[in-house]
């Protein structure tokens, strides 16, 4: 048999070998594909079937408009002229080209020694699915579950058959200083089909600094409350990935979960002291923020005590 | 939404013609293939005749084939029966319905007109 | 040419009760097979498609099943408006071909 590879919506002609070229003939099309459970012999004098696949004057098979459904298996038997019967067989593949693919999210630099996402690359309209892959430098990179991670997402489109790929790639620089390219490519795995690139995106490796300072908010500003009243500590950390941020009270650390805020309901006066948080990052151990006074009395009763963050509400460490 | 709309004279003498006409909106009018069938009084349905979403295919049963034409218009989102050598038992209401390829069967149908042959 | 033979041609049944009708294909036609509501005077209106698919806007109390070259219109909950004929039609061969009819009437 014959393999046959169609673009979807597009025209496909199969020709039946050994047919005489104008009636009288005797032939006889068959079909096994996706809108049949069997083998449907086609009518010679057309029928509902005409709209998807229609034999010609010549004994070839017309299918107007292919469609993933008309994926299988065609034969012909015919007797030529001599009065051989003559035999063709087909195997009908379709595809469909996406759209080019795209990075959506691309990361605007990348930090050295901790995982970074690159982005997600997007490819829409595929038939068969086909396959996304990921370049560095022009090179095919090979995730290894470690420095090079790629989360994959098939879908397929309930209508239309046609498929949506997605790729995210997450990759750990080993140093700073660099400007490494990265690209995708999507490739249906069809001969003679070259891969569609997306555009690529080149990105800065910088070194993982410290971060630029922690900011502990107290609310109410000046940490002075009245009995039965809510105080709300917050960690305002800038570094990426966020880091966990424990709680110390008057040198202590508090049996809580990591979060970047503290929240203190009805205040009684066992909750006064000295607060911090503690932010401790993968690459650069802990940072403890200024600390801050936290006072439960009547209100209006005195001013900021000695230590306390005062009007700003802020305690700063560049 | 969907509007398919017969018209065409209702009594005609045997060995007369007459023509149907059903006028289509609210689809793509040439995507489709279009179907007229008919509904002799108090009996069942009865396929009439079929045409390709082109127009360069016909097709009939042996009951009508030879005396009635089936056409369109895409144009003009008409589709047409011509009815020549009527015979009393063609007396039915006529139906214009979309579809009549695998693809579809028959989705959508006219309200049907009634056709007498009679003398 | 394919015939469909549809059964029962008429049926008696009360509102709630479940109702079945079969048309028999006289050869494979796949599930090339429509279901159709008729009421007096009006056009027929389609049910179900390709065998067992519920058309736009059909209540769910309707269904079409498949086995082999016979197919079953089922009714699960008879309605006041359901009271109505009922066609199968083959559209695998031409000529496209009807079922005999079903009339549902009120017991």
């Known amino acids: 048999g014959q393999n046959i590879t169609a673009r979807i919506g597009e025209p496909l002609v199969l020709s039946c070998k050994g047919a005489p070229k104008k009636p009288p003939q005797q032939l006889e099309w068959k079909l096994n594909t996706g809108r049949t459970e069997a083998w449907k012999v086609l009518s010679p004098q057309g029928g509902p079937w005409d709209s998807v696949a229609r034999i010609l004057p010549n004994g070839s098979l017309l299918l107007p408009a292919t469609g993933i459904v008309d994926e299988g298996t065609f034969r012909c038997r015919a007797t030529n002229r001599r009065g051989k019967e003559v035999k063709s067989n087909y195997r009908v593949r379709v595809y469909q080209i996406p759209g080019k693919p795209e990075i959506v999210d691309p990361a605007s630099e990348l930090t050295a020694s901790v995982p970074n996402k690159v982005g997600t690359c997007v490819s829409e309209g595929s038939y068969p699915a086909g396959t996304l892959s990921w370049h560095l430098d022009g090179k095919l990179l090979i995730p290894d579950g470690k420095e090079t991670l790629v989360k994959e997402e098939t879908r397929r489109h309930p209508e239309t058959g046609l498929f949506t790929l997605r790729s995210e790639l997450t990759v750990i620089p080993t140093q700073g200083g660099t400007h490494p390219t990265f690209s995708c490519s999507f490739s249906l795995g069809l001969p003679r089909r070259r891969p569609l690139n997306t555009a690529p995106i080149q990105l800065r490796v910088r070194e993982p600094g410290p971060p630029e300072g922690i900011q502990l908010l107290v609310e109410p500003e000046g940490g002075i409350v009245a009995p039965g009243g809510t105080v709300t500590l917050t960690c305002a950390i800038s570094a990426q990935p966020p880091p966990q941020v424990h709680w110390i009270k008057d040198g202590a650390p508090l049996p809580l979960a990591p979060s970047p805020v503290l929240l203190l309901p009805e205040v009684g006066h066992e909750d006064e002291g000295t607060y911090s948080c503690v932010a401790t990052h993968p690459s650069h151990g802990p940072q403890e923020s200024p600390p801050v006074s936290i006072r439960v009395t009547e209100t209006g009763d005195e001013g900021p005590a000695e230590g306390s963050v005062g009007e700003s509400g802020l305690g700063t460490l560049a | 939404e969907v509007q398919l709309v017969e018209s065409g004279v209702g009594l005609v003498q045997p060995g007369g013609s007459l023509r149907l006409s059903c006028a289509a909106s609210?689809?793509?009018?040439?995507?489709?293939?279009m179907t007229w069938v008919r509904q002799a009084p108090g009996k069942g349905l009865e396929w009439v005749a079929s045409i390709d979403n082109s127009g360069d295919n016909t097709y009939y049963p042996d009951s009508v084939k030879d005396r009635f034409t089936i056409s369109r218009d895409n144009a003009k989102n008409s589709l047409y029966l011509q009815m020549n050598s009527l015979r009393a038992e063609d007396t039915a209401v006529y139906y214009c319905?979309?579809?009549?390829?695998?693809?579809?069967?028959?989705?959508?149908w006219g309200q049907g007109t009634l056709v007498t042959v009679s003398s | 040419d394919i015939q469909m033979t549809q059964s029962p041609s008429s049926l008696s049944a009360s509102v709630g009760d479940r109702v079945t009708i079969t048309c028999r294909a006289s050869?494979?036609?796949?599930?090339?097979v429509n279901w159709f509501q008729q009421k007096p005077g009006k056009a027929p209106r389609r049910l179900i498609y390709r065998a067992t698919n519920l058309a736009d806007g059909v209540p769910s109390r309707f269904s079409g099943s498949r086995s082999g070259t016979d197919f079953t219109l089922t009714i699960s909950s008879l309605q006041p408006e359901d009271f109505a004929t009922y066609y199968c039609l083959e559209f695998d061969e031409h000529p496209l071909t009807f079922g005999g009819g079903t009339k549902v009437e009120i017991k």
């Open positions: 050869q494979d036609v796949g599930i090339y």
């Open positions: 319905a979309r579809g009549g390829d695998i693809t579809n069967g028959l989705d959508y």
């Open positions: 609210g689809f793509t009018f040439n995507n489709y293939w």
